[in-house]
Amino acid sequence: LSVQQGPNLLQVRQGSQATLVCQVDQATAWERLRVKWTKDGAILCQPYITNGSLSLGVCGPQGRLSWQAPSHLTLQLDPVSLNHSGAYVCWAAVEIPELEEAEGNITRLFVDPDDPTQNRNRIASFPG
């Protein structure tokens, strides 16, 4: 089982849309795939895919999940808020027929505020 995640870095404006993609591949077929998205180590959602369908369509605040055969799991954040900034990781595990698991690399999401002055103040507030 292999998982490829993208993009590595994503910078979007507050109120717009962010799309994170996870490509899940396995040489042999699987009956049930458990997937998980985390943000800064905290679980956003942990649905499974079976018979070509996701058991859950929502994933965290303003997050929508979709599965496009053969291998694309998409997390769409819309609208994006400042709280969405963080490090996202996609994880997958084949539960049936045999346990296999893998995870993607981090996607770092940066959300710019609508007000550019707010952005300047935020950057200036970092120490040192």
Epitope: S2, A27, A29, L33, S71
Partner: antibody
Framework: QVQLQESGPGLVKPSQTLSLTCTVS??????????WSWIRQHPGKGLEWIGY???????YYNPSLKSRVTISVDTSKNQFSLKLSSVTAADTAVYYC????????????WGQGTLVTVSS | DIVMTQTPLSLPVTPGEPASISCRSS????????????LNWYLQKPGQSPKLLIY???TRLSGVPDRFSGSGSGTDFTLKISRVEAEDVGDYFC?????????FGDGTRLEIK
Amino acid sequence: QVQLQESGPGLVKPSQTLSLTCTVSGFSITTGGYYWSWIRQHPGKGLEWIGYIYTSGRTYYNPSLKSRVTISVDTSKNQFSLKLSSVTAADTAVYYCADMADKGGWFAYWGQGTLVTVSS
Amino acid sequence: DIVMTQTPLSLPVTPGEPASISCRSSQSLFSSNTKRNYLNWYLQKPGQSPKLLIYHASTRLSGVPDRFSGSGSGTDFTLKISRVEAEDVGDYFCQQHYETPLTFGDGTRLEIK
């Protein structure tokens, strides 16, 4: 250009262990998402999957041979190996190494094959 | 284990004529999760190792002549050669990768009449 090359003795005595090595060039066997495989073909017959080892080191064997097979990897030499114990004349075959990727599921590159004869 | 049954075992063909090889699996090779058939076709020319022709039942590998085509879904698959050429001689194998153990058909030997 990815190339695979089998090497090992062409003659093995019954009850002994058959040992073959596959040297991979043009590609690192530590690359994620690949299965390094062994397949054999009895003279004038079809193909039989022996097993493979995944990038993670996990092995998968054909149940018909599982008790006698070991597949391992030597990353420092970019090689993977097959050991088949307690051989009999029925193990006489051309042995191929090949690779398979998660993003496919087919055997993309094959070695040229090496004939191993089991005879005293 | 999934049993792959190929017919015919031998196929004599006149150059320029079409050829068809059938492959049947003992269980479905179609996944509703990935919408794929886990079935490949290989050609093994005399004295050579097998080479992939078709993957996922119907996708031709880049560089494979378009006279080769694959079709079918579930348990019944077909490899067709629209106009056989002398260089097409060899053994054709189907292979399933739906599950382990991976299994091959017994092969079809294509020969020129």
